[in-house]
């Protein structure tokens, strides 16, 4: 079951999954300048058995001016492992999520691939949130969101997480040592049901959040 | 030249039922996303609902869930909004777009489509 709407926003925040439930569908976006191959897949599906998950169907880019131009998806395993090395892990994670069975990792870029990420999110995905940069994060509790179903309907729980303006950045997800306890806010009831996460903030945790389905800027 | 034509608004009383369609042409690509935007006088564009042309993933705004069904005709090209159990509220222009590439949903998800038609007028009475 896919989740209808978006993490909660938290203002000053950006939020990521460590790994994504069987079901996650990744959309196949490409840079300006460039599109998906004529017959090529809308989605990045992550499918598998109970003992391994991968992601299914190539993302394919090609020059938006040069029709025959493909570019492949899937790097060579060398170049996927090197790449795997810039994910963060988290520090307050007993158990690699990305290894738990029923979860596929970080898809790997794909050539001229658009910046950020919309992922349709299925029920039971959690994600975390991390304020960014130039913000400090106060929290009472877990600073992650979790798609729940509840009566025939989905929602995210909302994470306790306040990012004041202190110029000192806490790491993903909710390294900082708690501190102040704000009030929980209510559950969430935003509307945008696609999430799109800069793609950055997987290498650069210090990215600015530039969602697309909240802001314009991008997308 | 993409060109997507809107039909099948009109004045209808609350409670009652109207189909939107949208038939696209020129569109070079075998499978792209649609969706429904509807703007009322003095408010931003709202989406309403989008789906791709194979169906994979459908998805609605929370404000016309459970009311409102986006489907595709017998040409590909071409997408239905079946509205019902209308309310004032509803009254607005209502888009259809277009985009190369996954359904994008949401409160500011507009600026990701990027072929649009004209627009056509639904009035909901009390």
């Known amino acids: 079951e896919l989740c209808d709407d978006d993490p909660p926003e938290i203002p000053h925040a950006t939020f990521k999954a460590m790994a994504y439930k069987e079901g996650t569908m990744l959309n196949c976006e490409c840079k300006r300048g460039f599109r998906r191959i004529k017959s090529g897949s809308l989605y990045m599906l992550c499918t598998g058995n109970s003992s391994h998950s991968s992601w299914d169907n190539q993302c394919q880019c090609t020059s938006s001016a040069t029709r025959n131009t493909t570019k492949q998806v899937t790097p060579q395993p060398e170049e996927q492992k090197e790449r795997k090395t810039t994910e963060m892990q988290s520090p307050m994670q007993p158990v690699d999520q990305a290894s738990l069975p029923g979860h596929c990792r970080e898809p790997p870029p794909w050539e001229n691939e658009a910046t950020e990420r919309i992922y349709h999110f299925v029920v039971g995905q959690m994600v975390y949130y991390q304020c960014v940069q130039g913000y400090r994060a106060l929290h009472r509790g877990p600073a992650e969101s979790v798609c729940k179903m509840t009566h025939g309907k989905t929602r995210w729980t909302q994470p306790q997480l306040i990012c004041t303006g202190e110029m000192e950045t806490s790491q993903f997800p909710g390294e900082e040592k708690p501190q102040a306890s704000p009030e929980g806010r209510p559950e969430s009831e935003t509307s945008c049901l696609v999430t799109t996460t800069d793609f950055q903030i997987q290498t650069e945790m210090a990215a600015t959040m530039e969602t697309s389905i909240f802001t314009t800027e991008y997308q | 030249q993409v060109q997507l034509v809107e039909s099948g608004g009109g004045l209808v009383q609350a409670g009652g039922s109207l189909r939107l369609s949208c038939a696209a042409s020129g569109i070079p690509f075998d499978n792209y996303a649609m969706g429904w935007f509807r703007q009322a006088p003095g408010k931003e564009r709202e989406f309403v609902a989008a789906?791709?042309?194979?169906?994979?993933?459908?998805r609605y705004g929370d404000s016309v869930k459970g009311r409102f069904t986006i489907s595709r005709g017998n040409a590909k090209n071409t997408v239905f909004l079946q509205m019902n159990s209308l309310k004032p509220e509803d009254t607005a222009v209502y888009y259809c777009?277009?985009?190369?590439?996954?359904?994008?949903?949401?409160?500011?998800?507009?600026?990701?489509?990027?072929?649009w038609g004209q627009g056509t007028q639904v009035t909901v009475s009390s």
């Open positions: 789906r791709d042309l194979e169906g994979i993933i459908t």
């Open positions: 777009a277009a985009r190369d590439g996954g359904v994008v949903a949401g409160s500011r998800s507009s600026a990701q489509y990027n072929y």
